[in-house]
Interface confidence: medium
C-alpha cells in the first residue's frame, strides 16, 4: 500500500500569451498521494466550475480559457490539496495579446483655413499600437503644424489649402496592422478679392468695363452694388476657373459713381464676404466737385463709421469753413447727448443722425445730398423715440432745454420726400428694416402732429403694427 | 506757435520694446486727430498710425498692427505709441504730427522734429 | 495694399512752372482721397502745403496750389525759386477693407 504523500507541483505555472478569440491553457501538474483536489483562481477570485467560459480536465490539472477576452487579463493560480500536509499553489499570468483595432475611426472633416483641424483616431490593442497617418498614398510627415497625438489623433494647427485630401490612420503592432477608411479634410477658403475693379475717368456716354476676381472655397459668388444699391443698369459677364471667379461689369457711364464688388462664400451656417470698390467719375466733373454749396466725399470720421455705408459717398456743407470737421463735431455732440435716451430709441436716433447730417450723395454737375425718406423719420419720432420725442416738443414750448433730445441736429420729417413718391429720392435707414422684423410690442403712440402730417400706407405685411401704420419695404 | 516734442528713442534689440511719447502745446491738444509717421534712413515717409480727438478709435498701417499701440492723454496734452516686437526694418525717425482737424485722417498740419528709433543687435 | 506713385525726380528752372503729379498704382486719385502735399528739406522735418486736393496750408505761398489732373492729384508750382529745391511727397487717404493714409515715395525737385 502506497504512503500518503503531500501534493508537489511539478510543472509550475507560466505566463501564457494568448491573442482575443483563441484559447488559453494553463497546466498545473501536481504529484500527491491520495489524488489531490486542485482549485484555481483568477486574481484571487475562485473560478466555478460551472463557468462554461472555462474548460478543467486531467482531474483540475489543465485549465483552458475557450475564448479569451481582453478582460481575461490577470493572475492565474492552481491550488492543490490532499489533506497531507498543507495545500500548495503555483500562480502565472495571462497577458492578452490584441491585434491593433480602430475603436474611433477618423471622419470627413470640412475646415476653414487657419484654424486648428483634429482627425480622430483611438486604438486598442496589445501590446499598444503605435499610429501613423497616410495622406493620399504617401506616408504623412510630422513638423511644426501637423503631429500625431499621444491619443493617435492627428493635429494640424493653421490648416492650409494644401493640407486638404484623403487620409488614413494606419494602427500597428507586433501582431498586426490596422487601417482605418479613407476620409477626406476639406479646407474651406474665405472669400477673398485678387484682383479689385479699377477706377476710371472717362468722357460722358462711355463705355466701361469693371472687372472684379475672387477666390475662395467654396468659389464665391460676386454681386455688384451702385452707390450702395444692386446695380440698375450694365450688364455682367462670369466665369470660374480653378476656383477663381472672374466678374466684368460693362456700364454706359452717364453719371459718376462709387462700385463695389462684393464676394461672398459660405461656410456651414456662416458667410464670408470681401469688398472692393472703384468710382467711375466723369473727366469734365472733377474740376466742379467742390461747388459753392457742398461736395461728395468718403467719411473719414469715427462717429458714424458703424452707421453709414462703408463705400458711401456723402454730402459735405462748404457752408462750414471745415465742413467735415463742423459735421463731426455736431454729430459727436449728438451722440453724446443720446446716451440719456431709452435703449430702443438709441440706434433709431443714431441712424436717423447720421445720415441726416452725413446724407448720401450723388456726384453730378452740382453735387446733391439725398435726404432721409419721411417714414424712416416718422418711424423713429413717432415709434422708437415716441416718449423722447414728446419730452422734447413739451420741453420747448415751455422753453426748457436741459436734456435728452434737444440739442440734437433732427430733420423736420414732413419735409422730406416720401419714398412711396420716388424710391429713388430719399435714403432708407437699413437699421430701422432690420429692427421693425424684431419687434412685436410697440408703445402707445399720441402723434404731437396732425394725423394729415403722417403719410397713411398702403397696408404691407412688413408694416409697422402701430397706428398710424409706416409701410417701409 | 503749435509745438510737438517728441521723445523715448534709442537703440533696442529685436523683439524689444520702446513707448515715444509726444508732448503737444500752443493748440487745443483734445480738439485735434494726431498721428505717428516714420522715415528710415534715406527713404521716404510711412503713415504708421492714426487716432481721433477722442481717443475713441485707433488705426494702423498694416504691417505694425498687433505690435504698436497708439494712445492719447488729453488731460496731460501728450500722445503716445508703444511698439512691442521690434524688428530692424522698424529702425526710423518717428515723427509726431497733428491733424488739421478732429478726425484720424485729415492732413497732417504740424509736425515734431522726430525721434530716432534704432532697432539693432 | 494701396501704392501711391510720384515721380522720383523733377528740375525745373528759376521762374519756371512744374507739375508733380500723384497716382493710384490701381485706379484714379479722387477728392475723395483728400490728396495733401509735404515739403521737406533734407535734415528738417516735413512741412505742410496743400491739403484735400487744393487747399493752401495757412503761411503757403500762392505760388502752389493743388488740383486734381485726370486721374492723378497734382502740385503745381509756379515761378520756381531755388529754395523750392525739396523733396515733395503726397499723402492720400485711402479705403480698402480699413482706414488708413498712405505716402508716395517722394519727388526729388532740382531748381536748376
Known amino acids: 500500500e502506497k504512503l500518503p504523500k503531500a501534493p508537489v507541483i511539478t510543472t509550475p505555472l507560466e505566463t501564457v500569451d494568448a491573442l482575443v478569440e483563441e484559447v488559453a491553457t494553463f497546466m498545473c501538474a501536481v504529484e500527491s498521494y491520495p489524488q489531490p483536489e486542485i482549485s484555481w483562481t483568477r486574481n484571487k477570485i475562485l473560478i466555478k466550475l460551472f463557468d462554461t467560459r472555462y474548460s478543467i480536465r486531467e482531474n483540475g490539472q489543465l485549465l483552458t480559457i475557450l475564448s479569451v477576452e481582453d478582460s481575461d487579463d490577470g493572475i492565474y493560480c492552481c491550488i492543490a490539496n490532499n489533506g497531507v500536509g498543507g495545500a500548495v499553489e503555483s500562480c502565472g499570468a495571462l497577458q492578452v495579446k490584441m491585434k491593433p483595432k480602430i475603436t474611433r475611426p477618423p471622419i470627413n472633416v470640412k475646415i476653414i483655413e487657419g484654424l486648428k483641424a483634429v482627425l480622430p483616431c483611438t486604438t486598442m490593442g496589445n501590446p499598444k499600437p503605435s499610429v501613423s497617418w497616410i495622406k493620399g498614398d504617401n506616408a504623412l510627415r510630422e513638423n511644426s503644424r501637423i503631429a500625431v497625438l499621444e491619443s493617435g489623433s492627428l493635429r494640424i494647427h493653421n490648416v492650409q489649402k494644401e493640407d486638404a485630401g484623403q487620409y488614413r490612420c494606419v494602427a500597428k503592432n507586433s501582431l498586426g496592422t490596422a487601417y482605418s477608411k479613407l476620409v477626406k479634410l476639406e479646407v474651406e477658403v474665405f472669400a477673398r478679392i485678387l484682383r479689385a475693379p479699377e477706377s476710371h475717368n472717362v468722357t460722358f456716354g462711355s463705355f466701361v468695363t469693371l472687372r472684379c476676381t475672387a477666390i475662395g472655397i467654396p468659389v464665391p459668388t460676386i454681386s455688384w452694388i451702385e452707390n450702395g444699391n444692386a446695380v440698375s443698369s450694365g450688364s455682367i459677364q462670369e466665369s470660374v476657373k480653378d476656383r477663381v471667379i472672374d466678374s466684368r461689369l460693362q456700364l454706359f457711364i452717364t453719371k459718376p459713381g462709387l462700385y463695389t464688388c462684393i464676394a461672398t462664400n459660405k461656410h456651414g451656417e456662416k458667410f464670408s464676404t470681401a469688398k472692393a470698390a472703384a468710382t467711375v467719375s466723369i473727366a469734365e466733373w472733377s474740376k466742379s466737385q467742390k461747388d459753392s454749396q457742398g461736395y461728395c466725399a468718403q467719411y473719414r470720421g469715427e462717429v458714424c463709421d458703424a452707421v453709414l455705408a462703408k463705400d458711401a459717398l456723402v454730402f459735405f456743407n462748404t457752408s462750414y469753413r471745415d465742413p467735415e470737421d463742423a459735421q463731426e463735431l455736431l454729430i459727436h455732440t449728438a451722440w453724446n447727448e443720446l446716451k440719456a435716451v431709452s435703449p430702443l430709441c438709441r440706434p433709431a436716433a443714431e441712424a436717423l443722425l447720421c445720415n441726416h447730417l452725413f446724407q448720401e450723395c450723388s456726384p453730378g454737375v452740382v453735387p446733391t445730398p439725398m435726404p432721409i425718406c419721411r417714414e424712416y423719420c416718422l418711424a423713429v419720432k413717432e415709434l422708437f423715440c415716441a416718449k423722447e420725442w414728446q419730452a422734447m416738443e413739451g420741453k420747448a414750448h415751455r422753453g426748457l432745454y436741459r436734456s435728452g433730445m434737444h440739442l440734437l441736429p433732427v430733420p423736420e420729417c414732413s419735409k422730406l420726400p416720401s419714398m412711396h413718391r420716388d424710391p429713388t429720392a430719399c435714403t432708407r435707414l437699413p437699421y430701422l428694416d432690420y429692427k421693425k422684423e424684431n419687434i412685436t410690442t410697440f408703445p402707445s403712440i399720441t402723434s404731437s402732429r396732425p394725423s394729415a402730417d403722417i403719410p397713411n400706407l398702403p397696408a404691407s405685411t412688413s408694416s409697422f403694427a402701430v397706428s398710424p401704420a409706416y409701410s417701409m419695404t | 506757435e503749435v509745438q510737438l516734442l517728441e521723445s523715448g528713442g534709442g537703440l533696442v534689440q529685436p523683439g524689444g520694446s520702446l513707448r515715444l511719447s509726444c508732448a503737444a502745446s500752443g493748440f487745443t491738444f483734445s480738439d485735434y486727430g494726431m498721428s505717428w509717421v516714420r522715415q528710415a534712413p534715406g527713404k521716404g515717409l510711412e503713415w504708421v498710425s492714426a487716432i481721433p480727438w477722442s481717443g475713441g478709435s485707433t488705426y494702423y498701417k498694416e504691417s505694425v498692427k498687433g505690435r504698436f499701440t497708439i494712445s492719447r492723454d488729453n488731460s496731460k496734452n501728450t500722445l503716445y505709441l508703444q511698439m512691442n516686437s521690434l524688428r530692424a526694418e522698424d529702425t526710423a525717425v518717428y515723427y509726431c504730427?497733428?491733424?488739421?482737424?478732429?478726425?484720424?485722417?485729415?492732413?497732417?498740419?504740424?509736425w515734431g522734429q522726430g525721434t530716432l528709433v534704432t532697432v539693432s543687435s | 495694399q494701396t501704392v501711391v506713385t510720384q515721380e522720383p525726380s523733377f528740375s525745373v528752372s528759376p521762374g519756371g512752372t512744374v507739375t508733380l503729379t500723384c497716382g493710384l498704382s490701381?485706379?484714379?486719385?479722387?477728392?475723395?482721397?483728400?490728396p495733401d502735399w509735404y515739403q521737406q528739406t533734407p535734415g528738417q522735418a516735413p512741412r505742410t502745403l496743400i491739403y484735400s486736393t487744393d487747399s493752401r496750408h495757412s503761411g503757403v505761398p500762392d505760388r502752389f496750389s493743388g488740383s486734381i489732373l485726370g486721374n492723378k492729384a497734382a502740385l503745381t508750382i509756379t515761378g520756381a525759386q531755388a529754395d523750392d529745391e525739396s523733396d515733395y511727397y503726397c499723402?492720400?487717404?485711402?479705403?480698402?477693407?480699413?482706414?488708413?493714409?498712405?505716402f508716395g515715395g517722394g519727388t526729388k525737385l532740382t531748381v536748376l
Open positions: 499723402g492720400l487717404y485711402s479705403y480698402s477693407g480699413s482706414k488708413n493714409y498712405v
Open positions: 504730427a497733428k491733424r488739421s482737424g478732429r478726425i484720424a485722417f485729415g492732413a497732417l498740419d504740424a
Open positions: 490701381s485706379g484714379s486719385v479722387t477728392s475723395s482721397n483728400y
